[in-house]
Every structure is written in structure tokens, then in C-alpha cells.
Interface confidence: low
Amino acid sequence: GSGIFQLRLQEFVNQRGMLANGQSCEPGCRTFFRICLKHFQATFSEGPCTFGNVSTPVLGTNSFVVRDKNSGSGRNPLQLPFNFTWPGTFSLNIQAWHTPGDDLRPETSPGNSLISQIIIQGSLAVGKIWRTDEQNDTLTRLSYSYRVICSDNYYGESCSRLCKKRDDHFGHYECQPDGSLSCLPGWTGKYCDQPICLSGCHEQNGYCSKPDECICRPGWQGRLCNECIPHNGCRHGTCSIPWQCACDEGWGGLFCDQDLNYCTHHSPCKNGSTCSNSGPKGYTCTCLPGYTGEHCELGLSKCASNPCRNGGSCKDQENSYHCLCPPGYYGQHCEHSTLTCADSPCFNGGSCRERNQGSSYACECPPNFTGSNCEKKVDRCTSNPCANGGQCQNRGPSRTCRCRPGFTGTHCELHISDCARSPCAHGGTCHDLENGPVCTCPAGFSGRRCEVRITHDACASGPCFNGATCYTGLSPNNFVCNCPYGFVGSRCEFPVGLPPSFPWVA
């Protein structure tokens, strides 16, 4: 039921031991009570006790005090439960009867006689306060009190609001005095069945199944699920949405793993050589004289530059070199001659010119010959004039450089930028890489050259079933469905056989 009308009998006085008909009880009036509770009537009439009725066992003889008793026979206060909205008004009839029979079940005895009765009509609000009253007639007096209270789990002015406190799957709340729910800490919602996630947990990217939790949806990470997860393998890039790989400055490629500024980041060229951000490894070292190697890390022989002139032979020494001069020459590099034009010192048709009043000479060499005495055939490639891996080729009196792809210029010193042709459409950013240009596309475009306009959001049509999360730009079909537990298929359309053990975790 929704409430209880309680009647506490306190004292009954019938000093002369008289019945209502004027007769006296022998040996005394063995008294029990009948109570009838019904809807309010201005004039109390016989008829059903619409709100309930109850009888007591024999409580005493003639005059007696009624003690409180919480259980068993003779319970006091008397309980009249009801299971409807308490109307706030009532009629109550209390009858005192004498029985010659059974103390415990006097109702069933023949020969019961009425001693007295009282009738109360009026209004009564639900509450814990007892209303106390006393009624007299010529022979008897009855003291009593009464009240209406709500049954367990019922609340409100008329006991019409049901509320059971709970802390389980279906709700986490206590009940307020008016029957409204008061959520336990960490819970919210109409029925307190929605957990309050960890403070700051991202509304869209995180969720929780219990308070102070923050579980990240696919593509998000961090304590508050507010950090996107970049594309798997993304090396030097970041994301603003999941699975993106937006390259840091100086990096390029799908995974931002191609260094566009290797020279600055790594300084690979040694011994004062010059570094260029080009070539098969992303950089090229141009060595100073006396050094060689990919990184100019190898010092050449001191004789490598052929410092000895006039046919002198060069010998390496610890930090230097020494020239052994042929007959007729002297000096550190055999640059001075003891010969004169009279000795015909010029080879290969060279012309001799006297100097210093005939004490020395100089040879004027014909084309393709060089040296103090025109003794050397010119090899125009010995100075390694071709940069960036170009091949040097002697062509008679001249030489040419055959450049590697991507380079040009007399000495292959000019880098042909793949980006010079502006291959990236729609404002894409171009990066020169070993295998050709790479385009970073602006929003709304894709493809190797940003030539594909993304005309619609492939997720807008809701292609994913069963609560799956849709992501765009990750596949040729332009969307990917991330299935919830229990579903598979490209659109999460197929349920998986469910395991028998429950409950599941959300």
C-alpha cells in the first residue's frame, strides 16, 4: 500500500461496568474495540468501511490503560493500511464491545454487547505528528490519538509518489522527503543512471560507464580523450583530427619521414664542405680541395693536387709533401729552371720565350697541352668539375658535364626543382623528394597532385550501421566504419554470435 492510518488507543474508562443498553456486565465488561475507517461523510452511515477496518482482542475490563505493543495480538497503535492516494479527509467509527467469550478472538463469540461508540469526521494531512483526542459520553471516556503516514518507499502529501532508493545498474539515488530522486555522487540523469565522467573528459571523443572514468573513442587518446591519434607510422607530424599526419616544418612524405632540410638537421658534411638539400639521400656534400668521400670525411694525399711542376715527382710526408726535381729544375715545386731556350725545353710544339735576360724561359703551349714544358696532355676532367654526381667527358679541346636527373648547368651545379613546374593543384604545398614531388593538399582535396575534389562528406549519409563510428579519408571508398563490440562488416552490418557470459561491460 501507499500509506497507513494509525490509531493509538490510550485509555478507556467505564467505571460502572455498564453496557450501552443500561445493563451491567457480569463480572465486568471484558472490552475489545472495532474500528471502521471510511471516506468522509457529513453524516456517518452504516455500510462498508471503504478505507479499512480492524478489531482488537480483549484489552481490559471496565477501565484500563492500553499499552503500546509492536507485534502479535493486541498490537497498538492499530494499523489501517491503504493503497490509494490519501484524500486528506476521513470518517472514523470506534466501537467498544463487551464479550463473554474468547479473549483473543472476541469477534467470533456469540453474545457480544455494545458498550459505547464514537464517530470522528474531518480532515487529516499526512504527517508524523499524532493528533490526540478524548471522547466522553454519560458512561465512558476514551483517550486516543491518530495520524496518517506513508508506507516505505512512498512520499508526498498524499503518499502517491513511489521512490525506492537504489545503487545498481538501473539507478544510483536516494529519495528526498517529497519523493524526488537525489543522485548519489558521480551520477546524473533523470534516473541517476548516467555516470558523470572524469572532469574535462571530452564530450564527443570520450565516454564513461562509471563515474570519474574517461574512455576514449577510436582515434583519440590522453587522460581526457582530447588528443587525436596520428596516422600509424607518422614520424615527424601531428594531427588535428584522428589518423591525420600533418608534417612538421622541414619534413615531407605520407608519414612525414622524409627530411626536407637534412643539411640543417644533421650537418652531415665534414671538413668545411658545402651541404645541399638534394640528391638520392636528400643531401649532397661538395668537398673542399684535399678531401673526398660521401661526407668529405676522407683527406686526400698531399700529392693528389700534383704540386710538383716540370716533371718533378711528389713524395708524401707526414703533414706535407716533397718534390724531387728533374735535371735543370729547382725550387719547392721545381718551378725554377736552370735551362734556357737554347736547350729547347718546350715539348709538343711549344714555343720558348726567354725571360730575365736569357737566364730563364717560359713555354707557350699549343692547345690540349699544359705544364711548364708543355709536357702534359690536358685532361679537363681531373679537377672533378661536375657537381652533384655529374659525369665529366673530354670532348677534344673542351669538356662537358653529363648531369644526373634533376640537375643542370655547365657543372651540374643547378638543381632542377620538381616543384618549379607547380605540379600541386588547388593550392597544395609541393615538397621536392628523391622520388619526385610530394603534394600536401588543403582541406577538401586529395590525390597525388591534389587534383581530386572531395565533393561530399562520405559519412554524411550515415553509411555505418549498429552505432558504428564513421571516419572519412582513410580508404578508397572515402569512409571507414569502426564497429562496436558484437558487429563486423565494412558497414558493421553483421552481428557476431554473442558470448554466453554476461553482463557485458559497456
Epitope: 545498474h169 538501473f170 539507478g171 540523469g189 533523470k190 534516473y191 543512471d193 548516467q194 560507464s209 549498429n466 552505432g467 562496436p484 563490440y485 558484437g486 554476461f502 553482463p503 557485458w504 561491460v505 559497456a506
Partner: nanobody, 123 residues
Framework: EVQLVESGGGLVQAGGSLRLSCAAS????????MAWYRQAPGKEREYVAA????????YYADSVQSRFTISRDNAKNTVYLQMNSLKPEDTAVYYC????????????????WGQGTQVTVSS
């Protein structure tokens, strides 16, 4: 308006199994919580199991825990109750119910009820 139609009931020996189905039509099924209740003759309607809209969380009455499994197929707008190790005390009319989100999973909070399917377990 949502209509719910239960099927799969019948007579089975104690220890046997049955699979009840509840097909929903009308408004979007996948956004609703679904539940099974039962009512034995002369007894009050009793909660058996419920499942959240995503299918991610299921709840069971103590009396059926580990014997019954509730599941759902949102593509087919159907919820199932797999009943194993049936006992005579499982005999009842089984009702399917559903409710909109953000309400508690209790009998009087369910928006729509089916007509029920009879399950009888003989000993």
C-alpha cells in the same frame, strides 16, 4: 507507434532450452532499451533481463543469471532471450518491453509491451 511481437514459446522438458524472439516495428528500434519480463499464474510480473540500446550492457535477474542470455540485432529490429537449463519455476508468460533512452529499466517505466508468449517447463 511501436508494436512488439513475441515468439518462440512452447512446452519444453526441464533442463531443455528455448529461444524467444521479439520483433519490433514502428519507431527507430536501435535507440531503445529492451527487456524481457515474465508473469506466472497468480504472481506479479517479474523482471528477467534488459539490454542497453547499443547492445553493450546486459542485466539479469538473480534467478536467471548465467542460464539466460539477452541479445539484440538492431538490423533486424529484434531482441532475443536464449533460455538454457530451464526449470519448472521458469513457467510463465514472457513479455517483451521497450523504452526510450534516459529512463530506468523497471516494469512500470517501459513505454511499450508485447502480448506475451507462453513458456511451459515440465518436470
Amino acid at each position: 507507434e511501436v508494436q512488439l511481437v513475441e515468439s518462440g514459446g512452447g512446452l519444453v522438458q526441464a533442463g531443455g532450452s528455448l529461444r524467444l524472439s521479439c520483433a519490433a516495428s514502428g519507431r527507430t528500434f536501435s535507440s531503445y532499451a529492451m527487456a524481457w519480463y515474465r508473469q506466472a499464474p497468480g504472481k506479479e510480473r517479474e523482471y528477467v533481463a534488459a539490454i542497453r540500446w547499443s547492445g553493450g550492457t546486459a542485466y539479469y535477474a538473480d534467478s536467471v543469471q548465467s542460464r539466460f542470455t539477452i541479445s539484440r540485432d538492431n538490423a533486424k529490429n529484434t531482441v532475443y532471450l536464449q533460455m538454457n537449463s530451464l526449470k519448472p519455476e521458469d513457467t510463465a508468460v514472457y513479455y517483451c518491453a521497450n523504452r526510450a533512452p534516459d529512463t530506468r529499466l523497471e516494469p512500470y517505466e517501459y513505454d511499450h509491451w508485447g502480448q506475451g508468449t507462453q513458456v511451459t517447463v515440465s518436470s
